[in-house]
C-alpha cells in the first residue's frame, strides 16, 4: 500500500504533466518532438562549450606552467627533458583574465626567440 503522502506527490506530478501537455494527443506528440529537438540542441551546445573550454584549459595550462616559472610537467614517464622557462611560452592576450603581475610575467617571458 502506497502511503497517502507519497500518493499525493504522485498525483501532483501527474496533474502537472497533464497540465503541461494539455493532454490532447496531438499536442503531446508535437511537444515531445520539439522537446526532443530542444534537448538534442542543448546537448550539441553543451558539447560545443565543452570543446571550447577543453582547449582553453589546455592553452591555459601551458601558460600557467610558464608563468609560474615551473618546468612543463612530464605528462608520463616518457623521455621528457627538463624545460627552460622560456622554452615554450604561451602568450595570452585575453587581457581581462590577466592580473598586472601576470602581465609582467608575460612581458618578461615573451622575449620570443625567432624560430
Amino acid at each position: 500500500m502506497i502511503p497517502a503522502k507519497d500518493m499525493a506527490k504522485v498525483m501532483i506530478v501527474m496533474l502537472a504533466i497533464c497540465f503541461l501537455t494539455k493532454s490532447d494527443g496531438k499536442s503531446v506528440k508535437k511537444r515531445s518532438v520539439s522537446e526532443i529537438q530542444l534537448m538534442h540542441n542543448l546537448g550539441k551546445h553543451l558539447n560545443s562549450m565543452e570543446r571550447v573550454e577543453w582547449l582553453r584549459k589546455k592553452l591555459q595550462d601551458v601558460h600557467n606552467f610558464v608563468a609560474l616559472g615551473a618546468p612543463l610537467a612530464p605528462r608520463d614517464a616518457g623521455s621528457q627533458r627538463p624545460r627552460k622557462k622560456e622554452d615554450n611560452v604561451l602568450v595570452e592576450s585575453h587581457e581581462k583574465s590577466l592580473g598586472e603581475a601576470d602581465k609582467a610575467d608575460v612581458n618578461v617571458l615573451t622575449k620570443a626567440k625567432s624560430q
Partner: antibody
Framework: EVQLVQSGAEVKKPGESLKISCKGS????????IGWVRQMPGKGLEWMGI????????RYSPSFQGQVTISADMSISTAYLQWSSLKASDTAMYYC?????????????WGQGTLVTVSS | DIVMTQTPLSLSVTPGQPASISCKSS???????????LYWYLQKPGQPPQLLIY???NRFSGVPDRFSGSGSGTDFTLKISRVEAEDVGVYYC????????FGQGTKVEIK
Amino acid sequence: EVQLVQSGAEVKKPGESLKISCKGSRYIFTNYWIGWVRQMPGKGLEWMGIIYPGDSDTRYSPSFQGQVTISADMSISTAYLQWSSLKASDTAMYYCARQGDYVWGSFDSWGQGTLVTVSS
Amino acid sequence: DIVMTQTPLSLSVTPGQPASISCKSSQSLLDSDGKTYLYWYLQKPGQPPQLLIYEVSNRFSGVPDRFSGSGSGTDFTLKISRVEAEDVGVYYCMQSIQLWTFGQGTKVEIK
C-alpha cells in the same frame, strides 16, 4: 560542409599595414577556435596563434607575439590576421584553420590560403 | 618548443608500392588523459593541408584505408600500403600536446 573563405592575395611594400580575413560559414562560428598558420615559400607549416571568437580570447606562438595581431568579429563570422608594419620576411601563404569538430586538438577545416607578397 | 623531426624528407614511390614516413618528437606526446596528440596531414600541390590521421592511428573521415598510423611516446610512423597517383604531396606530422608544431614535411612523388 564547413567553409572557411579567406580574402584575396595581397602585394604590399615593406612598412605598410595589412589585415587579411577568414570568413566561416555553414557552422556556428562561436563554437570553435580558429588558428592561423604560416607557410613561407617552399617551406613547412608554422602555427602563429589562435582565437576563440566568442570572447576574443587570443593566444600567440612566442615566435609571432608582437609581430601580428589576431582578432575576430563574431557578428560577421570573420577572423582576422593583421600587421602594422610589414617586412619582406612576411612574404608567405597564410591559412586559417578551425578547431576539429570531434578531433579537438587539431584543425579539421582549412581556408584556401591568402598569399601575401611584401616587396619594394 | 617540441621539435618534430620527419624522415625521409623526400620519397619517390612506384604506384602500387608501399611507402613509410617516420616522425620523432623531442618529448613524449602522451598526455595525462591517455591520449597521444599526434596527427598526420597531407598537403597536395596548390591546396591547404588536409587531416589524414588523428591521435596516432585513427583515420579521419573520408580517408582511404590504405593510410595507417602507428607509434607511441616519441616515435611515430605513417604508412601508405599501396601508393596511388593522388597521394602525391607533402606529408606533415603535427603535435598538439603543447601548442602546435609541425614536422618539416616529407615530399612524396610518383616514379
